[in-house]
């Protein structure tokens, strides 16, 4: 396993609809054709997998149908979007990139993006 640099923004604020987007960029050391991207969430020293996708270079990034993540890839950067976030989902979201094929295998883990989620205030009842 060889190490690889990964960069991502330090902080992102989710939209009022609970959507957060950020870029994950990696320093590809060679001609990888198969890449796996995983988003991990770290909160209270617990790390859980949020979503993961494997893609072939030049093809779309495909997450599972029930995933809360979507994304697109362009060269050695991935644009990730996480949906359905609530205030309780606030935490550090870490981008993990693996170059799966061809060998050698490379692994890179970013420093994480702190995503802040603020639940919207409920609208006051209207008389109309």
């Amino acid at each position: 396993c060889k190490a690889m640099h990964v960069a991502q923004p330090a902080v992102v604020l989710a939209s009022s609809r609970g959507i957060a987007s950020f870029v994950c960029e990696y320093a590809s050391p060679g001609k990888a054709t198969e890449v796996r991207v995983t988003v991990l969430r770290q909160a209270d020293s617990q790390v859980t997998e949020v979503c993961a996708a494997t893609y072939m270079m030049g093809n779309e990034l495909t997450f599972l149908d029930d995933s809360i993540c979507t994304g697109t890839s362009s060269g050695n950067q991935v644009n990730l979007t996480i949906q359905g976030l609530r205030a309780m989902d606030t935490g550090l979201y870490i981008c993990k990139v693996e170059l799966m094929y061809p060998p050698p295998y490379y692994l890179g883990i970013g420093n994480g993006t702190q995503i802040y989620v603020i639940d919207p205030e409920p609208c006051p009842d209207s008389d109309f």
Epitope: H5, A7, Q8, E25, S28, A32, T33, G75, N76, Q77
Partner: nanobody, 126 residues
Framework: EVQLVESGGGLVQPGGSLRLSCASS????????VGWFRQAPGKEREELAC????????DYPGSVKGRFTITRDNSKNTVYLQMVSLRAEDTAVYYC???????????????????WGQGTQVTVSS
């Protein structure tokens, strides 16, 4: 849009040195990571070096590490490849390529670059 033009190639004796330049005639290069590659006749394109937008991050494959150095001068819109201790096997057409990135990293994979120059010939021979 960025348009890349390489220069600085030519004929050099074994053991000699050359400095190649990659300049943009279009957009400013400071939003782009830049890589240098080469291709010899009948061979695959080979990665040589890359440099991130700010110049703080560089990467090299083991094959040229220590002999080739990549630098950039964003005020001149130019990226350089300094090559020393040249050998006959360094004879090839040398290309630079650019990729717009958000952060400071760069890639050694030719697959990641979408803008390429026309190349400059380097011949190492006595």
């Amino acid at each position: 849009e960025v348009q890349l033009v390489e220069s600085g190639g030519g004929l050099v004796q074994p053991g000699g040195s050359l400095r190649l330049s990659c300049a943009s005639s279009g957009d400013t290069l400071e939003s782009f990571a830049v890589g240098w590659f080469r291709q010899a006749p009948g061979k695959e394109r080979e990665e040589l070096a890359c440099i991130g937008r700010t110049g703080e991050f560089t990467d090299y494959p083991g094959s040229v590490k220590g002999r080739f150095t990549i630098t950039r001068d964003n005020s001149k819109n130019t990226v350089y490849l300094q090559m020393v201790s040249l050998r006959a096997e360094d004879t090839a057409v040398y290309y630079c390529a650019a990729e717009r990135l958000v952060f400071h990293l760069c890639s050694l994979s030719e697959y990641d670059y979408d803008t390429w120059g026309q190349g400059t010939q380097v011949t190492v021979s006595s």
